[in-house]
């Protein structure tokens, strides 16, 4: 079971300094971007990091969404990240949900954080680099100090 | 403004109930989780229970699980603390909070408290 | 769950700088950045200084800093004023079946 405790608006970046936000296509992908540009492609660049609690003792879980005309909410179903239509909802009666990760600080690197999937144990979000484009994807972590699925996260309220 | 306005605290007898008020303004109350805190007197702060924007989650201290029940009317912008068989060792002043868990927009706020006092 | 460790009493000088632990486990502080800091002089509500471990609300003064190592945060006080003298909290959302555990609390003296 998951309770939300409320929602912040966050910058997300890569470990590149790469900005995460939403294309035309609602893929969500990194860019270098400057201040200025973060804030000229806002609300693709701004996200909703809703806050949950669990029922276990699991950890800081969240949802992703993001406000366009419409608020959509990150999704790892099948272990293929897309952002589907619909608002974090208040509660969630079951122990996995494709919309929800558990946040976790970096061992040792308290400013880094890590996006574990409920549904997928070990599994991580991550960013990698297909042909030109950066992307948000699912990954198994499969070495320590893995900085692809590590990300810094900035508030913006 | 925001305001949170404790009611329902005063006197009981060990073994008694008493239901605590928390009535909020100047926010979306419905958006956050909310929190009740004590302070005994002359001790330092402990969280009692906690309650999800919706009201599905509660959440409570091992000293007042089973015995403390949280709940809210987010139509009448309430909060609410059951308390059940009431010890001495519950004397405190109770807080209304909405902690600031994270940087959201409106902030952290308290309620003045009510103190609850368990004697014979 | 436990409450985090502070230490009971600290004092300084005006002007001095002081620093007040606070010590948890990886199941609050060392887990997660969602550490704060209360000052509360007598008879009155908690007053938030720092959120986000690090991060100030706006009106607190920037005498005021957080930082966080492992299981450990800390609240630096630089500057003393007499009107720090007060008592501090620190705060942390827990992975346990609670949601918030507290610091035990730290007495400030201003000397």
């Known amino acids: 079971y998951f309770g939300k405790l409320e929602s912040k608006l966050s910058v997300i970046r890569n470990l590149n300094d790469q900005v995460l936000f939403i294309d035309q296509g609602n893929r969500p992908l990194f860019e270098d971007m400057t201040d200025s540009d973060c804030r000229d492609n806002a609300p693709r660049t701004i996200f909703i990091i809703s806050m949950y609690k669990d029922s276990q003792p699991r950890g800081m879980a969240v949802t992703i969404s993001v406000k366009c005309e419409k608020i959509s909410t990150l999704s790892c179903e099948n272990k293929i990240i897309s952002f589907k239509e619909m608002n974090p909802p208040d509660n969630i009666k079951d122990t996995k949900s494709d919309i929800i990760f558990f946040q976790r600080s970096v061992p040792g690197h308290d400013n880094k954080m890590q996006f574990e999937s409920s549904s997928y144990e070990g599994y991580f979000l991550a960013c990698e680099k297909e042909r030109d484009l950066f992307k948000l994807i699912l990954k198994k972590e499969d070495e320590l100090g893995d900085r692809s699925i590590m990300f810094t996260v900035q508030n913006e309220d | 403004e925001v305001q949170l306005v404790e009611s329902g605290g005063g006197l009981v007898q060990p073994g008694g109930s008493m239901r605590l008020s928390c009535t909020a303004s100047?926010?979306?109350?419905?958006?956050?989780?909310m929190s009740w805190v004590r302070q005994a007197p002359g001790k330092g702060l402990e969280w009692v229970s906690g309650i999800s924007t919706g009201g599905g989650g509660t959440y409570y201290a091992d000293s007042v699980e089973g015995r403390f029940t949280i709940s809210r009317d987010n139509s009448k912008n309430t909060l609410y603390l059951q308390m059940n068989s009431l010890r001495a060792e519950d004397t405190a002043v109770y807080y209304c909070?909405?902690?600031?868990?994270?940087?959201?927009?409106?902030?952290?706020?308290w309620g003045q408290g009510t103190l609850v006092t368990v004697s014979s | 769950q436990s409450a985090l460790t502070q230490p009971a009493s600290v004092s300084g000088s005006p002007g001095q700088s002081i620093t007040i632990s606070c010590t948890g486990t990886?199941?609050?502080?060392?887990?997660?950045?969602?550490v704060s800091w209360y000052q509360q002089h007598p008879g009155k509500a908690p007053k938030l200084l720092i959120y986000?471990?690090?991060h100030r609300p706006s009106g607190v003064s920037d005498r005021f800093s957080g930082s966080k190592s492992g299981n450990t945060a800390s609240l630096t006080i630089s500057g003393l004023q007499a009107e720090d003298e007060a008592d501090y909290y620190c705060?942390?959302?827990?992975?346990?079946?609670?949601?918030?555990?507290f610091g035990t609390g730290t007495k400030l003296t201003v000397l």
């Open positions: 986000e471990v690090s």
């Open positions: 705060s942390s959302f827990t992975s346990s079946s609670s949601l918030y555990v």
């Open positions: 100047g926010f979306t109350f419905s958006e956050y989780a």
């Open positions: 990886s199941s609050d502080v060392g887990g997660y950045n969602y």
């Open positions: 909070a909405k902690p600031w868990l994270s940087g959201s927009r409106s902030g952290d706020f």
